[in-house]
């Protein structure tokens, strides 16, 4: 068990021309909270998935009033640390989701207002017990610098906080096999107390009170050899004559999902499908409220009216469900004309049309220049019964309508992925990198820079601690 | 340079345990985040995943076919084995082995393919 | 399981031109364990794109990869005739981890 802790240091207009306008006026005066959602592993950050690790929400920060005629400063930022308490171990790598979020403190009917400023979204790899991490991620024209860092709670320690440790017995040494507890030299690693009962040969615990069960045996407390119908033969399992084998228990064996989760097996873990009320890595978290930050995509958490409903999320355009967790398939009213493919980019719907047709539900049908407009300064040119666009710079697509992708250019180097934004593009980068480009790489403690990509990767592709 | 090589009995029997070997160079299952995976195609038809194989010895098997699976590997050799009892004629087919790298838990892949072999079941 | 479906299972099409594929899942991926791959008649299959969007090394430019949840896009911009092949989406997420049944692109 542990905290993660984040702390904001400052959240404000980024470098570069064009910069925002303050969220908050005399008129309307405002003031900033954070969210964070966190999920194990290197998952999607912007997945309909729960935040598996946890999620919290600030404090209120000032109340701020914008100078007229002034440029937006960096924003008055709320007091202390984000922490998101985790039960399980520290993954090691993770996902997160930091959003700003500005309550308007005017005259609105049915008391303040909330609107979602910015949001920034990355990968990391980090150690519990580590240093604070440095980050700067960029939304739009805001700048988000924060740092973070992952904690053990006592008893716990160790890189992912699964190592207990207890203090000394003796003063001069540990006991037989137990090494001391770094940095905490005066303390012992105590030995891993597996589930009462758990079979020593056949089970084994890397957590206290669990008991995982070596290839060949299951049952909660391993002691049940591993068999199916067609191995029993007078030779017993493994038979040569019946050429029956005898798989190892897989991890969703005695399904280590609780509270009627349902439980897949991944490349090399599993995953918990948890049921409306429940979530974490078993689904083992329950009681949600608004503090656990359970809507998803953008999605306003307020406090239910009645006991039996903690929570109502209010969906931005585009979502729906309890927990805004459904994207609405706007493509199923069939928009694109002429046999049209319906793209629904979230923000937006884009349809693909067929050659021949164009428009921005493929409504023009294209038989030459004659009639035919290129929009944003672009160019008509006749060839093969078709016409085509020869469009100005910054603009694409058939009619020349479309903004070109700012992502083209694939502008996240090191292996930053780049999603287009509706004010330009946001970078997500990878491990060992931060900045607006993710062009600085990051050495926490004075590290290295990150080791060579394992074969098969090429240089810029998302790169690995081996 | 990454290279595998599958081998196998080429034809066999109904009921008989089908034994193949993937042989491996370019990298090695004592490094963290490599592993190793088998792949089988029917002839002109889709692949279907078997079963995989990690460095640590983390395992994976289709439950389709998890009763009739075993996969183990020799490090020291750059070997994998797979092992399928029972087979029948349904089971003939090429079988790929492919390596498998978890780039971080960010993604996993089959990032590099042996050329197959093929294996008929025929009484 | 995830059952992917891709379409068309068959496609013509001119050189030049470009080309769009699908591949729909039952239930959910994470884009990140979402792969296409490439094989030709006779041999072995290769890693074409990975987590849906990142070209594999020596890839040319013009293939590229989108999409999330259950719809997936594979996108020649310009079809030239050594992209004739068979391409295969694959799901590295949940087990059993499963194939398409391929989308067979031919030169008209």
């Known amino acids: 068990a542990g905290v993660f802790e984040l702390q904001i240091h400052s959240f404000g207009p980024g470098p570069g021309p064009g910069a925002p306008r303050s969220p908050c006026s005399a008129r309307l005066p405002c003031r900033l909270f954070f969210r964070v959602c966190l999920k194990p592993g290197l998952s999607e950050e912007a997945a309909e998935s729960p935040c598996a690790l946890g999620a919290a929400l600030s404090a209120r920060g000032p109340v701020y009033t914008e100078q007229p005629g002034a440029p937006a400063p960096d924003l008055p930022l709320p007091d202390g640390l984000l922490q998101v308490p985790f039960r399980d171990a520290w993954p090691g790598t993770f996902s997160f989701i930091i959003e700003t979020w500005r309550e308007e403190l005017g005259d609105q009917i049915g008391g303040p207002a909330w609107s979602l400023l910015a949001r920034v979204a990355g990968r990391r790899r980090l150690a519990a017990g580590g240093p604070w991490a440095r980050d700067i991620q960029r939304a739009g024209a805001w700048e988000l610098r924060f740092s973070y860092r992952a904690r053990c709670e006592p008893p716990a320690v160790g890189t992912a906080c699964t190592r207990l440790c207890r203090p000394r017995s003796a003063p001069s040494r540990c006991g037989p096999g137990l090494r001391p507890c770094a940095p905490l030299e005066d303390e012992c690693e105590a030995p891993l107390v597996c589930r009462a009962g758990c079979s020593p040969e056949h089970g084994f615990c890397e957590q206290p009170g669990e008991c995982r069960c070596l290839e060949g045996w299951t049952g909660p407390l391993c002691t049940v050899p591993v068999s199916t119908s067609s191995c029993l033969s007078p030779r017993g399992p493994s038979s040569a004559t019946t050429g029956c084998l005898v798989p190892g228990p897989g991890p969703c064996d005695g399904n280590p999902c609780a509270n009627g989760g349902s439980c897949s097996e991944t490349p090399r873990s599993f995953e918990c499908t948890c049921p409306r009320g429940f979530y974490g890595l078993r689904c083992e978290v329950s009681g949600v409220t608004c503090a656990d930050g359970p809507c998803f995509n953008g999605g306003l958490c307020v406090g239910g009216a009645d006991p039996d409903s903690a929570y109502i999320c209010h969906c931005p355009p585009g979502f729906q469900g309890s927990n805004c967790e459904k994207r609405v398939d706007r493509c199923s009213l069939q928009p694109c004309r002429n046999g049209g493919l319906c793209l629904d980019l979230g923000h937006a719907l884009r349809c693909r049309c067929r050659a021949g047709f164009a428009g921005p539900r493929c409504e023009h049908d294209l038989d030459d220049c004659a009639g035919r407009a290129c929009a944003n300064g672009g160019t008509c040119v006749e060839g093969g019964g078709a016409h085509r666009c020869s469009c100005a710079l910054g603009f694409g697509g058939r009619d020349c309508r479309e903004r070109a992708d700012p992502c083209a250019a694939r502008p996240c180097a090191h292996g930053g992925r780049c999603y287009a934004h509706f004010s330009g593009l946001v970078c997500a980068c990878a491990p060992g990198y931060m900045g607006a480009r993710c062009e600085f790489p990051v050495h926490p403690d004075g590290a290295s820079a990150l080791p060579a990509a394992p074969p098969g990767l090429r240089p810029g592709d998302p790169q690995r601690y081996l | 340079q990454v290279t595998l090589k599958e081998s196998g009995p080429g034809i066999l029997q109904p009921s008989q345990t089908l034994s193949l070997t993937c042989s491996f160079s370019g990298f090695s299952l004592s490094t963290s985040g490599m592993g190793v995976g088998w792949i089988r195609q029917p002839s002109g038809k889709g692949l279907e995943w078997l079963a995989h194989i990690w460095w640590d010895d983390v395992k994976r098997y289709n439950p389709a076919l998890k009763s009739r699976l075993t996969i183990s590997k020799d490090t020291s050799s750059s070997q994998v084995f797979l092992k399928i009892a029972s087979v029948d004629t349904a089971d003939t087919a090429t079988y790929y082995c492919?390596?498998?790298?978890?780039?971080?838990?960010?993604?996993?892949?089959?990032?590099?393919w042996g050329q197959g072999t093929s294996v008929t079941v025929s009484s | 399981q995830i059952v992917l479906t891709q379409s068309p299972a068959i496609m013509s099409v001119s050189l030049g031109e470009r080309v769009t594929m699908t591949c729909t899942a039952s239930?959910?991926?994470?884009?990140?364990?979402l792969h296409w791959y490439q094989q030709k008649p006779g041999s072995s299959p290769k890693l074409w794109i990975y987590s849906t969007s990142n070209l594999a090394s020596g890839v040319p430019a013009r293939f590229s990869g989108s999409g999330s949840g259950t719809s997936y896009f594979f996108t020649i911009s310009s079809m030239e005739a050594e992209d004739a092949a068979t391409y295969y989406c694959h799901q590295y997420h949940r087990s059993p981890f499963t194939f398409g049944a391929g989308t067979k692109l031919k030169i008209r």
């Open positions: 239930s959910s991926v994470s884009s990140s364990y």
């Open positions: 492919a390596r498998i790298a978890d780039y971080g838990g960010d993604y996993y892949a089959m990032d590099y």
